[in-house]
Each structure stands twice: as C-alpha cells, then as structure tokens.
C-alpha cells in the first residue's frame, strides 16, 4: 500500500480467482483514543471500533472511502484504490491501446519544435468517474524539471457503438535546451483512477524522435509563361524553431490528380520553392521533415492547381 | 581545414559531408537486421557515448562567439563513433550484409573527422567503453542502439555546419 | 516445415570419440545459429555449444577441450565430434536451432528429436 | 557460470487452479533492458518446447494461459489455469553469457 496523494491510498493485488488478497491497516488521523468506529462509504454498517481498523483488501467491495466517528463526529478519512497485478502485469483498463506506431501505446505525444514544448494524448471510452494527473522528467534517476498542466477533455468521437474520448496534456521542460543533443529521455508518467481503480502509464522518448512540424505556410503558386509548369513557394511555420539556418526543413511536393488513382508526382527539396507541371483538376501539396533527423513528416499543406 | 589557434574549417564542405552521413546513419539503421529486441531495450547505452551538451557551444550564439570548442566536441565523437563501427560490435557475428551502407558510413565518419583535424594537431579523443557483447543477439542490440544515438550526434553536427556554412563563412 | 534430425551411433565404448551429425531442413544454416544439448536419464539439460551463422563456435568451459561443431551450409549438416567419451557422457543428445538473433535474444525455439547414446564398454 | 536455481522441484495443483514457477540467476541475466531468460516444457519421451522467450513473450501457438515475468535476476512462469496435457517438467534457460545454462527443472502434476 501507498499514498497516492493525502489520504488517498493505492493497495496493490495479484488478481487471480481466490487470491489471498493484501491485508491493510488504517489508523485514524486523531489523538482521540476511545469510542471510534469505522465505516466504509455511505453505508452506516460499523467495520470495526478503535484507533486502527484490519482488513482484508481482496476485490473492489473491499475498497472505497473508510471513515472513522466518534460520537457521530467524522475524524478522518482513507480512500482505498485498487492496482491491479494479473500475471505480473499491471491492468491497463482504463486507456485505449492506440497501436501505433507500436502495440501496448497507450499515449502518445507530439512536439512542433525543438523548444521542450509537447503535447500528449490518449484515449479512454470511459465517460465518468474519471480523473487524470500528469508528472514529467528529463531523466529518471536525477530528474530535470518538466511542467505539465491540467489533463483536459480534447476531443469526443464516435467509433461503432462506443464513444471515444481523447484527453490532452501540456508540457514544457523547465530548462530546455534546443540546440543540444539529448541524452536523457522525457519521462511522462500518467495516474488514471475510474470509481475505485487505480492505473499508471509511461511514455519516456526524446523531443527529437516526436517532433512532428506544422505544414508549410503561404504556399502559393505562380506560372511560368508560355509553359505547363507553375513555381510553387512556400514559407516555414511559424512555430518552427528558429533560426532556419540551424534548424532547417526539407520539403516533399506532391502533385495529385482528382482521382486516388492517378499517379502521384513527388519531387523532393531543401529550398522553399520548386517548379512542378500543373495538371488540370490537379492539387499541390506540401509537407515538411527534420532536414537532419527523420522524425514524423508534418501534414499537407494544400493548393488547387486551377 | 581546421588549425590550430581557431581558423574556420571547410565549413561548406563540412556541411556537405555531414548531411551525407545524416542520410547514412538512417538508411544503414533499418539495415543491420530483424529487430524486435529494439522495441525493448530500455537501458541506454548513450550514457556510453560522447553527446553533444548545452554547454559545448554548438548553439548559433555559441558558434558565433567560438566555434572551436564545439567543433572540438563534435571532431571528439566522429573519432568515438568512427572506433565503434570499426568494433567487434560491427565486425563479428552476426555478419553485416556485405552491402552494407556501414563501411560507407564508417569511412564518411574518418573523412568528416580529418576534414576537422590538420596533421599534427590532435584534440584529445574520449576512450571508446567496453560494452562487451558476447552473443550475437547483443551485438545486434547494440549496433541498432548505437546507430540511434550516431543519428541524434550527426544531426547536431549536420545544423552545426549548415549554419556555418549559412552564416560563418568567409 | 523447420525440422532437425539428428544421426549417429547409439553406443560408443568409453575413450572412443563420438561423432553426430544434424540435419537441417526448412531453414538455411546461413540464417540460424546450431545448438548442441544433451540430457542425462531423469536429469537436467546441459548446453554443448553453439555454431554461429557464420561459423563461429562457442563451447561450453566444462568440456571444451573434448568439442569440436562445424558444419556444411550446402548440405545442410552441422557435425559434433565429442572425443574420449566416458559413462558421465550416457544421454539423449539435442541439435537444436537457435531463433532469430534479434528477436530471440538467444532462446532454442526448434528442437530436433534426440538421439540417446550409451557409453559402454 | 550463471546458476539457475528453480523453485519448487515439484508441484501438485488441481485442475483449473494457477500454477507459478520461480526462477533465480546467480547474476543478472539482463543486458541494455533485454532480459535473456526463456522457459520450456518437456513433456516424457519428448524434446523440450520453448513456451515464452525473453522473460515474457509467448512464442506463437502456445496458450495464453501461460505467461512469463521478471527481470535481471528474478524471474517467474505462470500458469493461470492447470489443463491435464500441461503435466510436464518445466526449464528456465538463460543466453546472456556463455555457456548457456538450464534450470534444474520443475515437475507439475495434477493433485
């Protein structure tokens, strides 16, 4: 058992059928030392009376809030949590596996520059009775200060029968170091508790191999005269990090026809302009990467060819 | 080239060799086998190996105030990296596939290094770590760690010599 | 279909040298590391050695100076010769193939089906 | 040499109960995160079959009642639910330094 925060407690169990479950010892938080009785949520059902309560921690029924009395004053309270332990893993229940980019991901995170500023995410179908907290660190033996903010409701989707919610989180690494090679990775650990379970989930990755840039701004097309072809231009996003001579892109610009089917045309550059052939009904597009490391490309951005 | 006393070096053609060997380090990667074991090994072996840190002056400020002790930092792990592909680690079983894009990129490592180093000048170099693999199956962990962190070194070193290249050049 | 079948006499004479071979078929010998593992009656296992894919060899320290594993990549055979046989080496003796080095991290995952010899005089 | 030492010897457990094994190395059998640790089942008069590689990864077609646990120097085989055909004698194995070493083998048996 454990102090998840102020008399919130996490009891930890190998769930098994017939499991011999953890015994746990609660002692009220009181210099009072007679006539106290214990209860267990809204159920007026006296536990047990003294200082300390024994019990046997084997399923849910057994977990909740424990309140001790005394003359029908309440002294103090203990919430019980349950983490669960079946085969030597910890239950993941609460968070949807996304699978990507591998299996057993249950968050994900994202960051538009080199500035120690993320974002993560993850998916639950669970609509209630649901709170998030969010810790993070460069490193893990000797952490190096990262601030996440308040895990937030970002988006709901629906998904067959089931609704999908996805919850959001901010951070920044407190002394953040762009230009460096990183040689400690961001810890982000994520304490998920629905009614009376209790979860965690890790992430540990560098900013570089979650770098992901916002699409090409500006971009823009100009004829050539007397020709098919069009000089397409396009500017970084602002929320590149700066200056573009250090931190440099490179661009992929597809030409895409109105069918899926048609033959896509690529040309690959460093430069922020390219001449391509401008076929009719056709749209540019253009993406951005890392010049020097490849981490996720970013999304299109887009220009009808007409 | 780079001389004694801070003399810039070849910065464009630094630049040039740099993002060759960013492209190197990525295409040998996938390369040097099947690898589940990857997704796995948890424990670095960067701990092992020369970083580029905040305090070694490669930032633009830092470049533009002294490039030489970054240079000097960067020339230290392309002599690391180039040994350790040059190692038992890369040499033994199990066997890489003779086209392999490592010897490629062992060679751009020497030549990129020698680019920073005129003869008869020599930086001090950082002692390469006994990781001792002794099955193949560490050996395979091991190049796929160290080709990961040699891709996070030449990307610095890549912004280094494109910035240079960009805004040091005489 | 992976399968190993191992070959050889079933009863040696003590200081004799034994001499097992394996045949592999449903893999190359190029790919896959060769385990060697006996098996005394109603006893443990105990590793040999190992031929690596390119034709490296491991022996365990015990008896190293009485091992000796090669092999014919063409013909699909490894060979163990195991000299000055004595009645501790009575066993059921495995060629076993190695999984996946990246993968695998060194676990046997196919068995042959053993051959047990006798030293005896 | 790495000393496996496997616990208990033998194990009688009812039909449909869990069944754990432990095994313990003289030293770690961990290497960079990897831990180096696999089980087998022997069932009389046949060769070993490996049932999890690398501590905790079921090899394919083996039931998911069987699962594995443990790094470094501690590790252990679970299985959730006896069937009669997983009567046998079970291995740990580790390949993280030569020579290749073997538990002394665990026997279940139906109670």
């Known amino acids: 058992i454990w102090e998840l925060k102020k008399d919130v407690y996490v009891v930890e169990l190998d769930w098994y059928p017939d499991a011999p479950g953890e015994m746990v010892v609660l002692t009220c938080d009181t210099p009072e030392e007679d006539g106290i009785t214990w209860t267990l949520d809204q159920s007026s059902e006296v536990l047990g009376s003294g200082k300390t309560l024994t019990i046997q921690v084997k399923e849910f029924g057994d977990a909740g809030q424990y309140t001790c009395h005394k003359g029908g004053e309440v002294l103090s309270h203990s919430l019980l949590l349950l983490h669960k332990k079946e085969d030597g893993i910890w239950s993941t229940d609460i968070l949807k596996d996304q699978k990507e980019p591998k299996n057993k991901t249950f968050l994900r995170c994202e960051a538009k520059n080199y500035s120690g500023r993320f974002t993560c995410w993850w998916l639950t179908t669970i609509s209630t009775d649901l709170t998030f907290s969010v810790k993070s660190s460069r490193g893990s033996s000797d952490p190096q200060g990262v601030t996440c903010g308040a895990a937030t409701l970002s988006a709901e989707r629906v998904r067959g029968d089931n609704k999908e919610y996805e919850y959001s989180v901010e951070c920044q690494e407190d002394s953040a170091c762009p230009a460096a090679e990183e040689s400690l990775p961001i810890e982000v650990m994520v304490d998920a508790v629905h009614k009376l379970k209790y979860e965690n989930y890790t992430s540990s990755f560098f900013i570089r191999d979650i770098i992901k840039p916002d699409p090409p701004k500006n971009l823009q097309l100009k004829p050539l005269k007397n020709s098919r072809q069009v000089e397409v231009s396009w500017e970084y996003p602002d929320t590149w990090s700066t200056p573009h001579s250090y931190f440099s892109l490179t661009f992929c610009v597809q030409v895409q026809g109105k069918s899926k089917r048609e033959k896509k045309d690529r040309v690959f550059t460093d430069k922020t302009s390219a001449t391509v052939i401008c076929r009719k009904n056709a749209s540019i597009s253009v993406r951005a990467q890392d010049r020097y490391y490849s981490s996720s490309w970013s999304e299109w951005a887009s220009v009808p060819c007409s | 080239r780079a001389v004694p006393g801070g003399s810039s070096p070849a910065w464009t053609q630094c630049q040039q060799l740099s993002q060759k060997l960013c492209t190197l380090a990525w295409s040998a990667h996938p390369l040097v086998g099947h690898m589940d074991l990857r997704e796995e090994g948890d424990e670095e072996t960067t701990n092992d190996v020369p970083h580029i840190q905040c305090g070694d002056g490669c930032d633009p400020q830092g470049l533009r105030d002294n490039s030489q002790f970054c240079l000097q930092r960067i020339h230290q792990g392309l002599i690391f990296y180039e040994k350790l592909l040059g190692s038992d680690i890369f040499t033994g079983e199990p066997s890489l596939l003779p086209d392999s894009p490592v010897g490629q990129l062992h060679a751009s490592l020497l030549g990129l290094s020698q680019l920073l180093q005129p003869e008869g000048h020599h930086w001090e170099t950082q002692q390469i770590p006994s990781l001792s693999p002794s099955q193949p199956w560490q050996r395979l962990l091991l190049r796929f760690k160290i080709l990961r962190s040699l891709q996070a070194f030449v990307a610095v070193a890549a912004r280094v010599f494109a910035h240079g290249a960009a805004t040091l050049s005489p | 279909e992976v399968t190993l079948k191992e070959s050889g006499p079933v009863l040696v004479k003590p200081t004799e040298t034994l001499t097992l071979t394996c045949t592999v078929s449903?893999?190359?010998?190029?790919?896959?590391?060769i385990s060697w593992v006996r098996q005394p009656p109603g006893k443990a296992l105990e590793w040999l050695g190992v031929i690596w894919t390119g034709g490296g060899t491991n022996y365990n320290s015990g008896i190293k100076s009485r091992l000796t594993i090669s092999k014919d990549n063409s013909k699909s055979q490894v060979v163990l010769t195991m000299t000055n046989m004595d009645p501790v080496d009575t066993a059921r003796y495995y060629c076993?193939?190695?999984?996946?080095?990246?993968?695998?991290?060194?676990?046997?995952?196919?068995w042959g089906q053993g051959t047990t010899v006798t030293v005896s005089s | 040499d790495i000393v496996l030492t496997q616990s208990p010897d033998s194990l009688a457990v009812s039909l449909g109960e869990r069944a754990t094994i432990n095994c313990r190395a003289s030293e770690s059998v961990d290497y960079y995160g990897i831990s180096s640790m696999h089980w087998f089942q022997q069932k009389p008069g046949q060769p070993p079959k490996l049932l999890i590689y690398?501590?905790?990864n079921l090899e394919s077609g083996i039931p998911d009642r069987f699962s594995g646990s443990g790094s470094r120097t501690d590790f252990t085989l679970t299985i959730s639910s006896l069937q009669a055909e997983d009567v046998a004698v079970y291995y740990c194995?580790?390949?993280?330094?030569?020579?290749?070493?073997f538990g002394g083998g665990t026997k279940v048996e139906i109670k």
């Open positions: 449903g893999f190359s010998l190029t790919s896959y590391a």
């Open positions: 076993v193939r190695e999984g996946d080095y990246g993968s695998y991290a060194g676990a046997m995952d196919y």
């Open positions: 194995q580790q390949a993280n330094k030569d020579p290749y070493t």
């Open positions: 690398r501590a905790s």
